[in-house]
């Protein structure tokens, strides 16, 4: 009897000792986790569905690169020493998705694609590149596509309420659709320098028959497919004593 | 019976290093949750779900390398000393959504795609690429997509809403739909300068039948295929003496 | 410049570097993109006397206190950042780097 | 400029880095969408004498000051930062580097 | 009309360095990820490695420090060059439009190419 | 090393069975949903069936189907045709540019 009460005892301190260890692994985390969002500049950790992310994570090349780029832990020829690491999270690649604008509606009230919201923080001079992607949808039969990417602008005299950002033609072949991008660095440093000016763009992918091929408003299978700017951002970290 | 009484001690002492360990573990995240929420200037984390996400998420190229960019953990030649060391959060890319705006709207009275809301922490200068990610939808057959970005302005005199940002031609095949990205980065950087001037974007993307191929409003199966901007901006924090 | 590395398994007592792994699925942080999950890692352990001391001269400072004392504490000698992709609730994707999100090294400060 | 590095299973006692891993989906972080987890690590163990200090002169201070000192305390002396991709709550996707997220060494301190 | 095609050496030696050219017509390079992925004489799919629209590289774990792949977008091609070459290494060798596994990655091939590993 | 295990290694069913094909992997694949299923009959390259778990490839006809998340997936062909014996695979994606296949599963028509 009096041994089975050791082992009892002995079972209890491995369950105790597990218990601590349990506890405070998840007091690191808790506080790991509060870290992530200081730096990350958030107050709450952002409130969304992995079905939310499913549907509005582009499927597009520059978000599976960007998921590919690092392995589960990488160590970049960096010597992390204390001294020299800055607190808060550098960007360096924002995809920004479109956001309804009043000044983007049809005709019948539905909103038009597209308008780029942007943070103030983004400094003009300090974005690398700007790609606006646009999925293109599949086509049936070998076809010829006018994209063309306009920038909305206050209507002028003459009634002119765009202005060409962009237009390219591309040959598309029946299959898959395919993913395009289109650089509009300086649009986008001129909606920074001149936040006013972002009225939105509109896209049009137009085939051989006018049909619009650019996924602007996803259909049906099309979660990720909307349009989206990715913009690259240089960052120059100044140091400080502290 | 005292080498037996020992034993149980012994193994008491390891359940409840167990259980502290798992207690000081729970606060260690707690922390680390709220370090980050603190880092990221987040009150609380952003009230989204998974289904949220995954409709949100873009589907495009720019999201997909972001997520493949890095490894789990990547040590990016930064020495990482303390003393060193920035608090919050630094924006290397934004992703931004088109959000609804008073004036996209259509005459039944929808909202119209596209209106991107920035926060005037974007500085114009800091913006290095912007792109602006348009869907556009499957075709049947081979054709030419005009595809046509344009930025909504203060109505002129003449009545121009308008102007272009970028207007590009693409050739469709028929298959699955395909992103295009337009560089909008100094329409963008405008807008950062001059908030005011960003009144949204309307997106067209017309095949040669005339229909829109762009996805500005995501139908059913089409999450993730909203038109958003993907914006990299570089970061120069300042050091401060702590 | 050094550290122990310890494991869960480890009978080191002195200040250690310990694995912990940092998974944002676990925890439903679904807003985070990539990396699902990263080693973050820790320090725990003794600092007793000079052992592991980035600041050696703490130790005097130590023997001129003796009482109340709860000596050296195990921390981060060396941190290093971690890439992350993620939501913002903005309707933006963010990839940028955040610092010192991994322990490289632990030592007692 | 040196840390111990121990796990769950280390015996060590003295301030060690330890693995932790930071799980944002465990605890419903689906905010955060990259990394979903990341390796935190965190300091622990005791700080005696000039172990694992990284500025050892503080020893010298509780010397001097016997009562009421709770001695160094194991500290990171070293941190690096991580990438996020996040939804900030704002219609936007931010993918930025957050620093000091990771222990890459403790201390005491 | 989207097309893919691999070629180079159909024999190659022991210790030899192989080199495959995907020449791709009707897909844009600077737009679009290119996989590697070989398949040894009555066995499955291996996947071999990538090289993302933007240029960088992933490669199978296996094929680390053996592997290289490039592009040349003007001149619509992909190369695998493949160091030390051993007779496990026969295979037919194909390129594809995309990764497979993401989106809808995958969904053109090459025809393949038969590489014999064989002094 | 990530493992992807199909089951079972050989079917064999008579024209209008359903066909169900299996496919586990060692870890969880990204965002639980990037796993696709291809068709490869001999002397051809892949094909690609099944997309994001779910989503059934351009061109693909409709009693292909696939299901599941994370580590566990499956396909199914609700009504086997003679053209649909060849080999099936999975692929799956982890992020950090990680990629694997299954062995393959060879359905055969009795």
């Known amino acids: 009897e009096g041994s089975e009460r050791e082992e009892n005892v002995e079972k209890e301190g491995l369950c105790n000792a597990c218990a601590w260890r349990q506890n405070t692994r998840y007091s690191r985390i808790e506080a790991i986790k509060i870290q992530i969002l200081s730096k990350l500049r958030l107050e709450t950790a952002p409130n969304i569905s992995k079905d939310a992310i499913r549907q509005l994570l582009p499927r597009a090349p520059p978000l599976r690169e960007l998921i590919d780029q690092y392995d589960v832990q990488r160590d970049d020829s960096s010597d992390g020493s204390l001294e020299d690491d800055d607190y808060h999270a550098t960007t360096e690649t924002i995809i920004t998705m479109p956001t309804e604008s009043d000044f983007l509606m049809q005709a019948d009230g539905k909103p038009k694609c597209c308008f780029f919201k942007f943070s103030s923080k983004i400094q003009y001079n300090k974005v690398v590149k700007a790609q606006l992607w646009i999925y293109l949808r599949p086509v049936k039969t070998p076809t010829t596509v006018f994209v063309q990417i306009l920038r909305l602008i206050k209507p002028m005299k003459d009634g002119t309420r765009y202005t060409g950002i962009r237009s390219l033609k591309l040959d598309m072949s029946p299959g898959t659709g395919i993913w395009q991008s289109i650089d509009v660095k300086t649009v986008l440093q001129n909606w920074l320098k001149q936040p006013e000016s972002n009225l939105g763009i509109e896209i049009k992918a137009l085939d051989e028959n006018g049909h619009d091929l650019a996924v602007t408003f996803p259909g049906p299978g099309e979660d990720g497919l909307n349009p989206f700017l990715e913009v690259k951002v240089t960052d120059t970290p100044k140091r400080s004593r502290r | 019976e005292g080498s037996e009484r020992e034993e149980n001690v012994e193994k008491e002492g390891l359940c409840n290093a167990c259980a502290w360990r798992q207690n000081t573990r729970y606060s260690r995240i707690e922390a680390i949750k709220i370090q980050i929420l603190s880092k990221l200037r987040l009150e609380t984390a952003p009230n989204i779900s998974k289904d949220a996400i995954r409709q949100l998420l873009p589907r495009a190229p720019p999201l997909r390398e972001l997520i493949d960019q890095y490894d789990v953990q990547r040590d990016d030649s930064s020495d990482g000393s303390l003393e060193d060391d920035d608090y919050h959060a630094t924006t290397e890319t934004i992703i931004t959504m088109p959000t609804e705006s008073d004036f996209l709207m259509q005459a039944d009275g929808k909202p119209k795609c596209c209106f991107f809301k920035f926060s005037s922490k974007i500085q114009y200068n800091k913006v290095v690429k912007a792109q602006l990610w348009i869907y556009l939808r499957p075709v049947k057959t081979p054709t030419t997509v005009f595809v046509q970005i344009l930025r909504l302005i203060k109505p002129m005199k003449d009545g121009t809403r308008y102007t272009g940002i970028r207007s590009l031609k693409l050739d469709m095949s028929p298959g699955t739909g395909i992103w295009q990205s337009i560089d909008v980065k100094t329409v963008l950087q405008n807008w950062l300068k001059q908030p005011e001037s960003n009144l949204g974007i309307e997106i067209k993307a017309l095949d040669e039948n005339g229909h829109d191929l762009a996805v500005t409003f995501p139908g059913p199966g089409e999450d993730g295929l909203n038109p958003f901007l993907e914006v990299k901006v570089t970061d120069t924090p300042k050091r401060s003496r702590r | 410049d050094f550290g122990l590395d310890c494991d869960e398994h480890s009978t080191e007592s002195r200040c250690c570097r310990y694995p912990l792994t940092v998974d944002f699925e676990a925890f439903g942080w679904d807003w985070i993109i990539a990396p699902k999950r990263y080693k973050a890692n820790y320090c725990s352990g003794e600092c007793e006397f000079v052992f592991l001391q980035k600041y050696p001269h703490t130790h005097l400072v130590h023997q001129a206190n003796p009482r109340g004392s709860a000596g050296p504490c195990c921390t981060p000698t060396k941190m290093s950042p971690i890439n992350m992709l993620y939501f913002n609730g903005k309707e933006q994707i963010i990839y940028g780097k955040i610092p010192a999100m991994v322990v490289d090294r632990c030592g007692c400060s | 400029d040196f840390g111990l590095d121990c796990d769950e299973h280390s015996t060590e006692s003295r301030c060690c880095r330890y693995p932790l891993t930071v799980d944002f989906e465990a605890f419903g972080w689906d905010w955060i969408i990259a990394p979903k987890r990341y390796k935190a690590n965190y300091c622990s163990g005791e700080c005696e004498f000039v172990f694992l200090q990284k500025y050892p002169h503080t020893h010298l201070v509780h010397q001097a000051n016997p009562r009421g000192s709770a001695g160094p305390c194991c500290t990171p002396t070293k941190m690096s930062p991580i990438n996020m991709l996040y939804f900030n709550g704002k219609e936007q996707i931010i993918y930025g580097k957050i620093p000091a997220m990771v222990v890459d060494r403790c201390g005491c301190s | 009309q989207v097309t893919l095609k691999e070629s180079g050496p159909v024999l190659v030696k022991p210790t030899e360095t192989l080199t495959l050219t995907c020449t791709v017509s009707?897909?844009?390079?600077?737009?679009?990820?290119i996989s590697w992925v070989r398949q040894a004489p009555g066995k499955g799919l291996e996947w071999v490695g990538i090289i993302s629209y933007a240029g960088s590289k992933y490669k199978a774990s296996w094929a680390k420090g053996r592997l290289t792949i490039s592009k040349d977008t003007s001149k619509n091609q992909v190369v695998l060059t493949m160091t030390n070459m051993d007779p496990v290494d026969t295979a037919t060798y194909y390129c594809a439009r995309g990764v497979p596994a993401y989106s809808h990655g995958g969904d053109l091939w090459g025809q393949g190419t038969l590489v014999t590993v064989s002094s | 090393d990530i493992v992807m295990t199909q089951s079972p290694a050989t079917l064999s069913l008579s024209p209008g069975e359903r066909a169900t094909l299996s496919c586990t992997s060692s870890?969880?694949?990204?965002?639980?949903?990037?796993l696709s299923w291809f068709q490869q009959k001999p002397g051809q390259p892949p094909k690609l069936l099944i997309y994001w778990a779910s989503t059934l490839a351009y061109g693909v006809p409709s009693r292909f189907s696939g299901s599941g998340s994370g580590t566990d997936f499956t396909l199914t062909i609700s009504s086997l045709q003679p053209e649909d014996a060849a080999t099936y695979y999975c692929a799956g994606g982890y992020g950090g540019g990680r990629y694997a296949f299954g062995q393959g599963t060879k359905v055969e028509i009795k």
């Open positions: 870890q969880s694949v990204y965002h639980a949903n990037w």
């Open positions: 009707g897909i844009d390079l600077s737009h679009t990820d």
